[in-house]
């Protein structure tokens, strides 16, 4: 058993049929010595008396808010949560496996630039009685500070018969140099509590590996005389690290119709303009990627050909 | 500790081309190592990230773009002084700071070159003959060093009398390649910045 936060405790249980469970001793936070009784949740049934209460925690029915009273007055609470371990593996029931970039990916993180700011998100099908707490650091043995905000519900989607909820959090490394060469990864830890179930999820990464620039901005077309060709130009996104001559991007320019199966024109360039063949009912799209360290491509910025 | 804006014209900057080749060569070599050594811990997640140049050179700080010198977090206290006469520079326009940056890059390359050559000598003794260093990568390191043209003491190649542990050598190769790729990215950024300034 360990303390998650004040008056909230996590009981780690090996979860299998007829498991013996864990013996837990609760102590009432009071100078009083006698006349103390214990109850669980909203029940008025007295579970025991005395300053301490010893319980055998085996299942979720044994978890919850234990309260010690004296003469009708509440003295203190202890909330017990369960963390299940099945076949030596901690449960991951609360969050959905996003399976990208690999299986067992519950947290996904992205950074728009090298400033040390990044966003992580996760998915769940649970809509109520759900809380998250996020901590982060650079390295784990001698951790350096990373400050994370509160996790918020950022999107809701319907997937077949299920609703899916996306939560996200923004974090900022306290003293980040955009030009630094990372040798210690960022660690992100998410505590998830659903009703009386506790789970924790972690992700470890270098900012350089989670870079995904914003799409290029200000796409403009200029038809070329006596030709099917069009000159398309764009600018670096505002959120990209500066100076751009140091933090350079490379671009992919594509002309394609509405369907992915349609024919297309595609060219890669390090410049902020390119010449492509425009077709009726097609769109010109441009996306960006760090020129020197191939992490993710940005989303496409698009303009119609016409 | 930063790069001034007054830097050479693009035409006078042959190092950019060499640094691009360097990044390409080390990336290819790392990819080859990951594939060949698939049953060794050779991915970014599996290895310890070590920097053999730590406390010996200060390339990131010495080559910091002017725009980032206002960022307190970028101003590390490490200082190293180097010989200052590089041929990638249009000499009259060169500042002391830029020479410091380029000589720091030169020292990095020299250190990695020695490590890689020592390692290759060990790998050549491996009866499995599983992996060797790409000669193209070693050649590209050499070309960039020549383009930088700094005179410095030659570092003797480390020779070891004991039997090499090939497993450890291959893991060390992965560690070195990962670190060198990150440094090659920095070098490429620096050359691009100098070329554009």
């Amino acid at each position: 058993i360990w303390e998650l936060k004040k008056d909230v405790y996590v009981v780690e249980l090996d979860w299998y049929p007829d498991a013996p469970g864990e013996m837990v001793v609760l102590t009432c936070d009071t100078p009083e010595e006698d006349g103390i009784t214990w109850t669980l949740d909203q029940s008025s049934e007295v579970l025991g008396s005395g300053k301490t209460l010893t319980i055998q925690v085996k299942e979720f029915g044994d978890a919850g808010q234990y309260t010690c009273h004296k003469g009708g007055e509440v003295l203190s609470h202890s909330l017990l949560l369960l963390h299940k371990k099945e076949d030596g593996i901690w449960s991951t029931d609360i969050l959905k496996d996003q399976k990208e970039p690999k299986n067992k990916t519950f947290l996904r993180c992205e950074a728009k630039n090298y400033s040390g700011r990044f966003t992580c998100w996760w998915l769940t099908t649970i809509s109520t009685d759900l809380t998250f707490s996020v901590k982060s650091s650079r390295g784990s043995s001698d951790p350096q500070g990373v400050t994370c905000g509160a996790a918020t519900l950022s999107a809701e989607r319907v997937r077949g018969d299920n609703k899916e909820y996306e939560y996200s959090v923004e974090c900022q490394e306290d003293s980040a140099c955009p030009a630094a060469e990372e040798s210690l990864p960022i660690e992100v830890m998410v505590d998830a509590v659903h009703k009386l179930k506790y789970e924790n999820y972690t992700s470890s990464f270098f900012i350089r590996d989670i870079i995904k620039p914003d799409p290029p901005k200000n796409l403009q077309l200029k038809p070329l005389k006596n030709s099917r060709q069009v000159e398309v130009s764009w600018e670096y996104p505002d959120t990209w690290s500066t100076p751009h001559s140091y933090f350079s991007l490379t671009f992919c320019v594509q002309v394609q119709g509405k369907s992915k199966r349609e024919k297309k024109d595609r060219v890669f360039t390090d410049k902020t303009s390119a010449t492509v063949i425009c077709r009726k009912n097609a769109s010109i799209s441009v996306r960006a990627q760090d020129r020197y360290y191939s992490s993710s491509w940005s989303e496409w910025a698009s303009v119609p050909c016409s | 500790r930063n790069l001034p804006v007054a830097t050479p014209d693009p035409g006078m900057f042959p190092c950019l081309h060499h640094s691009q080749n360097l990044l390409r060569a080390v990336s290819n070599m790392l990819q080859k190592a990951r594939q060949t050594l698939e049953f060794y811990p050779c991915t970014s997640e599996e290895i310890d990230h070590e920097d053999i140049t730590k406390d010996k050179t200060s390339t990131v700080e010495a080559c910091l773009p002017l725009e980032l010198t206002k960022n307190e977090s970028c101003l590390n206290s490490r200082e190293t002084s180097f010989i200052t006469n590089g041929s990638c520079l249009a000499s009259r326009k060169t500042s002391f700071m830029m020479a410091l940056c380029l000589s720091s890059i030169y020292e990095d390359l020299k250190m990695y070159q020695v490590e890689f050559k020592t390692m290759n000598a060990k790998l050549l003794m491996d009866p499995k003959r599983q992996i060797f260093l790409d000669q193209n990568m070693l050649a590209v390191i050499d070309e960039l060093m020549q383009a930088l043209n700094f005179n410095s003491e030659t570092v003797p190649q480390k020779s070891s009398l004991e039997e090499p542990d090939f497993y450890k050598t291959k893991i060390k190769l992965c560690i070195l390649l990962h670190a060198f790729r990150i440094r090659a990215v920095t070098i490429d950024r620096v050359m691009s910045y100098l070329n554009a300034s």
């Epitope: 024919k263 060219v267 890669f268 390090d270 | -």
Partner: antibody
Framework: QVQLVQSGAEVKKPGSSVKVSCKAS????????LHWVRQAPGQGLEWMGW????????EYAPKFQGRVTITADESTSTAYMELSSLRSEDTAVYYC???????????WGQGTLVTVSS | DIVMTQSPLSLPVTPGEPASISCRAS??????LHWYQQKPGQAPRLLIY???QSISGVPSRFSGSGSGTDFTLTISSLQPEDFATYLC?????????FGQGTKVEIK
């Protein structure tokens, strides 16, 4: 299986024209760009131009501009390349090639040898 | 026009050994470079597109690398059927242009 089948070899006199055909099978004809590329004996490849069979749009290499015409007939899934004012240096194998991507070629015809000789 | 220069023009290789062919562009073409194999009397066959992207059905011993002006096609271990001419092609701008070809011959 996508295939491009070209017309047979031709012998032409200098100053005349030649029209080579390229019939496509497998896949929808208008879903692909179609190019013509030639190869003189013992020489490299030389791109001549492309057509979008969907709308008849064409683009020609400046070297052949005014002398080459690429057309397409959707009803027969056939593309044509006509080269006029032939000279001896036009002796080459002429290939048609196609792709959904405009700028490179994933399927090629077998080639048509055009010999220009007086 | 962008001029593509291949080297060497002829490359004698022992079967089973690796081979590397170089292609250089007269100006930077990013990764807009494609590789083809051509055997005598046959049409070219696409091997690699956009410098390093592999084609399904092409053996994994063929790989490509490079960007900007310098590109390499590598055959990790030459098989008897690999003795042919290899051509690079740029697609950075029209007109599309090809290298003059590298003939890989049996040593």
């Amino acid at each position: 299986q996508v295939q491009l089948v070209q017309s047979g070899a031709e012998v032409k006199k200098p100053g005349s024209s030649v029209k080579v055909s390229c019939k496509a099978s497998g896949g929808t004809f208008s879903d692909y760009y179609l190019h013509w590329v030639r190869q003189a004996p013992g020489q490299g490849l030389e791109w001549m131009g492309w057509i979008d069979p969907e709308n008849g749009d064409t683009e020609y290499a400046p070297k052949f501009q005014g002398r080459v015409t690429i057309t397409a007939d959707e009803s027969t899934s056939t593309a044509y390349m006509e080269l006029s004012s032939l000279r001896s240096e036009d002796t080459a194998v002429y290939y048609c090639a196609r792709n959904k991507e405009l700028r490179y070629f994933d399927v090629w015809g077998q080639g048509t040898l055009v010999t220009v000789s007086s | 026009d962008i001029v593509m220069t291949q080297s060497p023009l002829s490359l004698p290789v022992t079967p089973g050994e690796p081979a590397s062919i170089s292609c250089r562009a007269s100006q930077s073409i990013s990764i807009n470079l494609h590789w083809y194999q051509q055997k005598p009397g046959q049409a070219p066959r696409l091997l690699i597109y956009f410098a390093s992207q592999s084609i399904s059905g092409v053996p994994s011993r063929f790989s490509g690398s490079g960007s900007g002006t310098d590109f390499t096609l590598t055959i990790s271990s030459l098989q008897p059927e690999d003795f042919a001419t290899y051509l690079c092609q740029q697609s950075n701008s029209f007109p599309l242009t090809f290298g003059q070809g590298t003939k890989v011959e049996i040593k």
